[in-house]
C-alpha cells in the first residue's frame, strides 16, 4: 500500500509524471515576478494536462566515468565524462523499428535487448516483446529468438549471459543467439512463480518485479520460488467491452490467511546441467514458523546473503551463505546468522533494511534502530551486539547509497532539524577517527533540500537530483572533489511557464502537543491575509512509515485548489509516520487506526486557534491508507469536519494483505488481535456519518485495496440509513490513472466548492 | 522428506573389500551431490568420496584415491562406495549425505554404517 507517493504528486497524467511516481517528490514557495497584474491563478486544466510537471535526470552507468542517456530525439547516447565525448550507440530509428520503449546494453557492450509491448500487471511487473541488436554488426540477432510475452529479462553482471523469466519459469542463455537451457520446470499461472514474486511479494516485501538475482561476475543465478497452491483467491469482474465480464482471480493472502511458501535456489550458470538449482536452507529459528524472504545481496561469486523474516514482523535473521566446491552446494553457518529484533514494533521501517558490505567481504553497513530509537548506521564485523554505530542523534540516516574504500555516502535528515528533508553525507571511513561532511547542505539552500543521490562504479563520479523546494535540478559531481561538473537538467521550460502563474504559499512548522512533534506542512493562496478565514482542506496519508510532510516541489491539484479556490490545505505527519524515530513510529504498533486520526484531529484544532480558519468550513481527503483515516476522521464524532471524501479506502483491516496488515497489527486471532482488527473497522462507525458530507470513491479492478472495502462501508452506510454520495470507476485499479484521473478530480473539485460553498 | 539409508558395513580383513550403498528418498540424486562422509574416534571428519549431478562428476580424498570407487544408479536413486584394498586406518562410522544435508543438523543425516577393518 504506497498511494502515498501518489497522493504526493497530485494527479499524474502526462507521461513525464507517470515516469516520476517512482521517486518520490513535492512542491516550492513563490516564483517572483513583479509584474503582478499579469499572474494568473492556477486552473483544473493546468493539473490534468501536467502542464507543470518536470523532469529528473538519473544517468544510467556503465562504468566508473560513462553513463547511457536517452535524448530528445529517442537516441541512446553513451557519453564519457573524462573525455567529454558523446555518441550515439542506438539510433531512434532502431529503436522505432520494433516501437522500443525501453533498452538495455550488455556489459560487454555488444548487445542492447529492446523492450516493446509494454503490458502492465501489477504496480511493478508487466510483460513484454523483447528484441536483440547485434551492436558490431548493426543487426537484429535471427534464430532462437525469444518467446513472447515475457515476464522478466535481464543481462548478467558481466559479459552477455541473459536470464529471462516465461510463463513462470527461468530460462538461461549463454549468449543472446543460443538456444535458450530451460532451469526451472514447475512455473504454473497463479500457483508456483520462479523468477518473479507473486502478487503479495511485489507489493509488501521485495517492491520489485523481478525475483533473480545473477553473482556479481555472472557465475551464479540466485533466484526465489513461490508456491501459492494454497493462498485463497480473490476474484473480481473486469466489465471490458465483451457481452460477459471476465473474472480476475489473484491468489492474495489476506489477514491471516494462508501465505506463499519461498525457497530460495542458486544455479551455476557456467554449467547449469551440473548438480541444478541448489537450494539455500533457511535458518532454523525462522523454519520453525512461517517466515518470509525478504532480500538477497551478493556479497562476492561464492558468497551471497540473505535476509529471512518471522510471519510476526519483529524477528529478521541476516544470513551469510558461501560456495562449498566439495558438495557444489550453499553452507550457511550458524556463526553468520545475525539477528535484528524490534521489542517496541516490527523489524525496520517500512522493510528490513539491507546490508552494504565494505571490502573484506564479510563485514557490512546496516541501518537499524540504535539504543534511543533513532535508525542510524552501523557496522557489522562479527556480531550485532558487537555493531560500531557510524551516525547517531535525534534524526535518522534513511539510505547507504555507496560504501567505497574510503567513503560511505548516505542520505539524511539531520540537517536543521527538518525530518522532510534529505541531504547527502559523506564519511570518511579510511581515515581515523571517520569524517563527516554534508554535500548538498549548502549548495542551492534555498531551492534545494530533499536530495537523491546516483553513484557511478567505485564512486568516481555521482549525480544528485534535487526534488525542491525550488523547481528540481540534476547535476553531475566529481566523486572524490564533490564538485559539480555541469547540470543534467534544470528544467528551464518549467521555470519560465510559472513565471506568470500565482503559485501557493507553502510552509512547513512543527506543533508541540502533549510530548509529540506533529509537522505540518500548510499550503496557503496567494493574497493569503491572516486577518481573513479560509476554508481548511486537510489531505491525509498517515500509513505506517509514510512522510507527506516533505520539502519538495509538486504542482498538484492541492496547488490548485489554493491558487484558484482560495482554500487552505494542510498535511500533518502524525504518530505512527516516519524518520523521527521509534517512539513516533511504533506508537501505532497494533492500534491502526487510532492515533494517526487523533493526530489530524489535533492539529485541525491547533489550526484554528491559529485564526484565519473558518471552523464551519473544514475538510478532509485521503486515497488508499489516507482514505482510511479520513473516513474515521469524518466518523469520529468531533463536529470538526463538514465534509470529505476517501479514495480506494481500506475498511478493514481483514480485508488487507497479509504481509503489510500483520506487520504492524499481529493476527486477526482471539488469542492475538481480532479484537482490534473488529474496533477498527471504518463500517463498525456508520452511524457517525450521519453529519457529514461524505464522498467514497473506487475502482471496480483494485487488485491492491478491493472494491469490497468500499462496498462494506456502502452497504453500512445504507443498513445504517446514513446518506452518502459515492463514484465507482470501472476496470480502474487502484490508481485510477488515465481519463479516470480527470473525471475523479473534476468530481473532488465540485463536491469540495459544493461543501465550501464556492461558485463555481 | 529426505532421508538417507546406508548400509553394507562390517568387518573386513586388511586388504578386503566391502560395497556401502545409499537409498535415498524424498529428492532426486541426479540433481545433487551425494557422497560419503566418514568419522572416526579422535578424527577430524573426512569426505571421503562424492559424486554430482547429471554429469556423475567425482571428487576423492587423497587417502582413498585409487582404491574406493563411488557411482551412482539415477534409476534406484541410490548411491555406492565401492571400497578395495582395505586399511585399519579406514575403520570408521560412513554417513552418507548430499548437497541437501551435509550442511544441515545432524537430525537430516542417517545412521551411519559402521566399517572395521581389522584382522
Known amino acids: 500500500m504506497k498511494t502515498w507517493v501518489k497522493i504526493v504528486f497530485g494527479v499524474a497524467t502526462s507521461a513525464v509524471l507517470a515516469l516520476l511516481v517512482m521517486c518520490i517528490v513535492l512542491r516550492p514557495s513563490r516564483v517572483h515576478n513583479s509584474e503582478e497584474n499579469t499572474m494568473r491563478a492556477l486552473t483544473l486544466k493546468d493539473i490534468l494536462n501536467g502542464t507543470f510537471s518536470y523532469k529528473t535526470f538519473f544517468p544510467n552507468w556503465i562504468s566508473g566515468q560513462e553513463y547511457l542517456h536517452q535524448s530528445a530525439d529517442n537516441n541512446i547516447v553513451l557519453y564519457n565524462i573524462e573525455t567529454g565525448q558523446s555518441y550515439t550507440i542506438l539510433s531512434n530509428r532502431t529503436m522505432k523499428s520494433v516501437n522500443a520503449s525501453n533498452y538495455g546494453l550488455s556489459p560487454d557492450r555488444q548487445f542492447v535487448y529492446l523492450e516493446s509491448d509494454y503490458s502492465k500487471l501489477w504496480r511493478y511487473s508487466y510483460t513484454a516483446t523483447y528484441y536483440i541488436y547485434d551492436l558490431s554488426n548493426g543487426e537484429f540477432v535471427r534464430g532462437n529468438e525469444l518467446p513472447r510475452p515475457i515476464q522478466y529479462l535481464c543481462w548478467s553482471p558481466v559479459g552477455s549471459k541473459l536470464a529471462y523469466v516465461y510463463q513462470n519459469n527461468i530460462y538461461l542463455k549463454q549468449r543472446p543467439g543460443d538456444p535458450p537451457f530451460q532451469i526451472t520446470f514447475n512455473g504454473r499461472e497463479n500457483k508456483i512463480f520462479n523468477g518473479i514474486p507473486d502478487w503479495v511479494y511485489e507489493e509488501e516485501m521485495l517492491a520489485t518485479k523481478y525475483a533473480l538475482w545473477w553473482s556479481p561476475n555472472g557465475k551464479f543465478l540466485a533466484y526465489a520460488e513461490f508456491n501459492d497452491t494454497d493462498i485463497p483467491v480473490i476474484a473480481y469482474s473486469y466489465y471490458g467491452d465483451e457481452q460477459y465480464p471476465r473474472t480476475i482471480n489473484i491468489p492474495y493472502p489476506k489477514a491471516g490467511a494462508k501465505n506463499p511458501v519461498v525457497r530460495i535456489f542458486i544455479i551455476d550458470t557456467t554449467y547449469p546441467a551440473y548438480v541444478g538449482p541448489q537450494e539455500v536452507p533457511v535458518p532454523a529459528m525462522i523454519a520453525s514458523s512461517d517466515y518470509y524472504f525478504s532480500w538477497l545481496t551478493w556479497v562476492t561469486d561464492e558468497r551471497v546473503c540473505l535476509q529471512w523474516l518471522k510471519r510476526v514482523q519483529n524477528v529478521s535473521v541476516l544470513s551469510i551463505c558461501d560456495f562449498r566446491e566439495d558438495w557444489q552446494t550453499w553452507d550457511c553457518p550458524k556463526t553468520q546468522e545475525h539477528i535484528e529484533e524490534s521489542r517496541t514494533g516490527w523489524a525496520g521501517g517500512f522493510f528490513v533494511s539491507t546490508p552494504v558490505f565494505s571490502y573484506d567481504a564479510i563485514s557490512y553497513y546496516k541501518i537499524f534502530s540504535d539504543k534511543d530509537g533513532y535508525k542510524h548506521i552501523h557496522y557489522i564485523k562479527d556480531t550485532v551486539e558487537n555493531a560500531i554505530q557510524i551516525t547517531s542523534g535525534k534524526w535518522e540516516a534513511i539510505n547507504i547509497f555507496r560504501v567505497t574504500q574510503d567513503s560511505l555516502f548516505y542520505s539524511s535528515n539531520e540537517f536543521e532539524e527538518y525530518p522532510g528533508r534529505r541531504n547527502i553525507y559523506r564519511i570518511s571511513i579510511g581515515s581515523y577517527p571517520p569524517s563527516k561532511k554534508c554535500v548538498t547542505c549548502h549548495l542551492r539552500k534555498e531551492r534545494c533540500q530533499y536530495y537523491t543521490a546516483s553513484f557511478s562504479d567505485y564512486a568516481k563520479y555521482y549525480a544528485l537530483v534535487c526534488y525542491g523546494p525550488g523547481i528540481p535540478i540534476s547535476t553531475l559531481h566529481d566523486g572524490r572533489t564533490d564538485q559539480e561538473i555541469k547540470i543534467l537538467e534544470e528544467n528551464k521550460e518549467l521555470e519560465n511557464a510559472l513565471k506568470n502563474i500565482q503559485l501557493p504559499k507553502e510552509e512547513i512548522k512543527k506543533l508541540e502537543v502533549d510530548e509529540i512533534t506533529l509537522w505540518y506542512k500548510m499550503i496557503l493562496p496567494p493574497q493569503f491575509d491572516r486577518s481573513k478565514k479560509y476554508p481548511l482542506l486537510i489531505q491525509v496519508y498517515g500509513g505506517p512509515c509514510s512522510q507527506s510532510v516533505r520539502s519538495v516541489f509538486a504542482v498538484n491539484w492541492i496547488s490548485y485548489l489554493a491558487s484558484k479556490e482560495g482554500m487552505v490545505i494542510a498535511l500533518v505527519d502524525g504518530r505512527g509516520t516516519a524518520f523521527q524515530g521509534d517512539k513516533l513510529l511504533y506508537a501505532v504498533y497494533r492500534k491502526l487506526g487510532v492515533y494517526e486520526v487523533e493526530d489530524q484531529i489535533t492539529a485541525v484544532r491547533k489550526f484554528i486557534e491559529m485564526g484565519f480558519i473558518d471552523e464551519k468550513r473544514i475538510a478532509i481527503w485521503g486515497w488508499s491508507y489516507g482514505g482510511y483515516v479520513s473516513s474515521l476522521a469524518l466518523a469520529s464524532g468531533t463536529g470538526l469536519f463538514k465534509c470529505g471524501i476517501a479514495v480506494a479506502p481500506v475498511s478493514s483491516w481483514e480485508y488487507y494483505a497479509s504481509v503489510y496488515t500483520e506487520r504492524f497489527m499481529g493476527l486477526p486471532t482471539k488469542d492475538d488481535n481480532l479484537e482490534h482488527y473488529k474496533n477498527s473497522t471504518v463500517m463498525a462507525r456508520a452511524e457517525y456519518f450521519r453529519n457529514v458530507d461524505y464522498l467514497l470513491i473506487h475502482g471496480t479492478a483494485d487488485d491492491n485495496v478491493h472494491f469490497q472495502n468500499s462496498a462494506q462501508i456502502a452497504k453500512a452506510l445504507v443498513n445504517a440509513q446514513v446518506d452518502f454520495q459515492a463514484m465507482w470507476y470501472s476496470d480502474q485499479n487502484h490508481g485510477l490513472s488515465g481519463l479516470s484521473t480527470n473525471h475523479l478530480y473534476t468530481h473532488m473539485t465540485h463536491f469540495l466548492k459544493q461543501c465550501f460553498s464556492l461558485s463555481d | 522428506e529426505v532421508q538417507l539409508v546406508e548400509s553394507g558395513g562390517g568387518l573386513v580383513q586388511p586388504g578386503g573389500s566391502l560395497r556401502l550403498s545409499c537409498a535415498a528418498s524424498?529428492?532426486?540424486?541426479?540433481?545433487?551431490?551425494i557422497g560419503w562422509v566418514r568419522r572416526a574416534p579422535g578424527k577430524e571428519e573426512e569426505l571421503v568420496a562424492r559424486?554430482?549431478?547429471?554429469?556423475?562428476?567425482?571428487r576423492y580424498a587423497d587417502s582413498v584415491k585409487g582404491r574406493f570407487t563411488i557411482s551412482a544408479d539415477t534409476s534406484k536413486n541410490t548411491a555406492y562406495l565401492q571400497m578395495n584394498s582395505l586399511r585399519a586406518e579406514d575403520t570408521a562410522v560412513y554417513y552418507c549425505?548430499?548437497?541437501?544435508?551435509?550442511?544441515?543438523?545432524?537430525?537430516?543425516w542417517g545412521q551411519g554404517t559402521t566399517v572395521t577393518v581389522s584382522s
Open positions: 549425505a548430499t548437497s541437501y544435508t551435509v550442511y544441515r543438523s545432524y537430525d537430516y
Open positions: 524424498g529428492f532426486n540424486i541426479k540433481d545433487t551431490c
Open positions: 559424486i554430482c549431478g547429471q554429469i556423475g562428476s567425482t
